[in-house]
């Protein structure tokens, strides 16, 4: 299971408890909160990570303008219900029987309701726009160097197939990373763009989910890339359903 045998740890998820209690003393790691065994050779699903966290945050425009249907995660942390595969259940409820529907990255996509609320399916987030602002530097980064470094990061650190990094846009000091992954494109074993984006978000915040690795040290041609603001927009395969009251607020 690629949990480090010698000291029995999970390189890709520090929110686990690992024990040499598998057959023959094999190391096996379980996610905090859910108790589900995790595959330490790849990223753990965002739902299991959130559950674990709750048991133990102009001219010549080339930047993407998020669509009117783009969602931002304004609700913050909650203790999610995960399905047997570790994915978010379509309907989430809190202890006071307030319920809402979420997308595949766990972001609310409907108004809140009561226990009678129905969420027929888990709607897939197929397009994620990561909007970063970097700290001032002597000069702008070279766009192609920046593009190459961010693609390398998602490929090597987050194990995301390069075809899912659709584009990297740069207009100093704003960087935008576009991740796209349709249901039909995602093969068995592929890292989900939602999971990769969540690991990246936590890295950027200095809250790395990787075991024992130093924090994220992003450099472009040796120059540190320090992020001072992050916004993530989520676009679903089916537009969200909010009341007009919210849309005009």
């Amino acid at each position: 299971h690629t949990a480090a045998q010698d000291n029995c740890t999970c390189p890709t998820n520090k929110m686990t408890v690992c024990s040499p209690d598998g057959p023959g003393g094999r190391c096996q790691c379980r996610a905090l909160g859910s108790g589900m065994a995790v595959d330490c050779s790849t990223l753990t699903s965002k739902c299991l990570l959130l559950k674990a966290r709750m048991s133990a945050p102009k001219n010549a425009r080339t930047l993407v303008r998020p669509s009117e249907h783009a969602l931002v995660d304004n609700d913050g942390l909650y203790d999610p219900d995960c399905d047997p595969e570790g994915r978010f259940k379509a309907r989430q409820c809190n202890q006071t029987s307030v319920c809402w529907c979420v997308n595949s990255v766990g972001v609310r996509r409907t108004d809140k309701g009561d226990l009678s609320l129905r969420c027929d399916e888990l709607v897939r987030t197929h397009h994620i726009l990561i909007d970063l602002r970097h700290r001032p530097t002597a000069g702008a980064f070279n766009h192609s160097d920046l593009d190459a470094e961010l693609r390398r990061l998602f490929r090597e650190r987050y194990r995301l197939h390069p075809k899912f990094v659709a584009a990297v846009h740069y207009e100093q000091p704003t960087i935008q990373i576009e991740l796209r992954q349709n249901t039909s494109q995602k093969a068995a074993g592929d890292v989900d763009i939602g999971d990769a984006a969540y690991y990246f978000e936590r890295d950027i915040k200095g809250e790395s989910l990787f075991q024992g690795r130093g924090g994220l040290d992003l450099r472009v041609r040796g120059e540190p890339l320090q992020v001072e603001r992050t916004l993530i927009y989520y676009l679903d395969e089916i537009p969200p359903k909010f009341s007009m009251k919210r849309l005009t607020a």
Epitope: V17, D21, G24, S34, M36, D39
Partner: antibody
Framework: QVQLQQSGPELVRPGTSVKMSCKAA????????IGWVKQRPGHGLEWIGN????????NYNENFKGKATLTADTFSSTAYMQLNSLTSADSAIYYC????????WGQGTTLTVSS | DIVMTQSPSSLTVTAGEKVTLSCKCS????????????LTWYQQKPGQPPKMLIY???IREPGVPDRFTGSGSGTDFTLTINNVQAEDLAVYYC?????????FGSGTKLEIK
């Protein structure tokens, strides 16, 4: 070899509480989960919860939240379970077990709640 | 919670026979990440604590006679006892450790003629 030695039988009054122990030997206590299981005649086996002494991580079956409290003392390699507000429904054999493969079980502690 | 259903609840066999015990689960116990089935079989003899026989659905514990075999995947699992012996008189339980809370089946009581 691995052993889990549980404390002796208990006869207690309804409404009181009891604390039973499970002393581990023969392995590194802090590296394995210890689970607790209830067995009543005609009710089979019920998983109460578990504790990881190496980090004091604890999980409870919802049915036993507020009823059972799990703790561990790493110095004496002993796990404890306290049961409170006892009723006749709590009369049972309680087992501690090292979870995972090669699961080792204690011999059980018989709890009788009677007035 | 995952519900574990065992059948039959009891059976009586003659020594030397082959026995098949069933355990069905309300959801799959096959973890898509680790590709293991998180199902355990226990044997409990009268007056004793349960003893682990099979882990991860099919891995026999050290010291368990090879006449005990675990099989199955997903939601349907089987414990097969070949050439049943008098000392196999016991209650057999399945348990999952897929996710919390771990739950047990209600058991199958094996009696020998």
């Amino acid at each position: 070899q691995v052993q889990l030695q549980q404390s002796g039988p208990e006869l207690v009054r309804p409404g009181t509480s009891v604390k039973m122990s499970c002393k581990a030997a023969g392995y590194t206590f802090t590296k394995f989960w210890i689970g607790w299981v209830k067995q009543r005649p005609g009710h089979g086996l019920e998983w109460i919860g578990n504790i990881y002494p190496g980090g004091a991580y604890i999980n409870y079956n919802e049915n036993f939240k507020g009823k059972a409290t799990l703790t561990a003392d790493t110095f004496s390699s002993t796990a404890y379970m306290q049961l409170n507000s006892l009723t006749s429904a709590d009369s049972a054999i309680y087992y501690c077990a090292r979870e995972g493969s090669s699961g080792y079980w204690g011999q059980g502690t018989t709890l009788t709640v009677s007035s | 919670d995952i519900v574990m259903t065992q059948s039959p609840s009891s059976l009586t066999v003659t020594a030397g026979e082959k026995v098949t015990l069933s355990c069905k689960c309300s959801q799959s116990l096959l973890n898509s990440g680790t590709q293991e089935n998180y199902l355990t079989w226990y044997q409990q003899k009268p007056g004793q604590p349960p003893k682990m026989l099979i882990y991860w659905a099919s891995i026999r514990e050290p010291g368990v006679p090879d006449r005990f075999t675990g099989s199955g995947s997903g939601t349907d699992f089987t414990l097969t006892i070949n050439n049943v012996q008098a000392e196999d008189l016991a209650v057999y339980y399945c348990q999952h450790d897929y996710s919390y809370p771990f739950t047990f089946g209600s058991g199958t009581k094996l009696e020998i003629k």
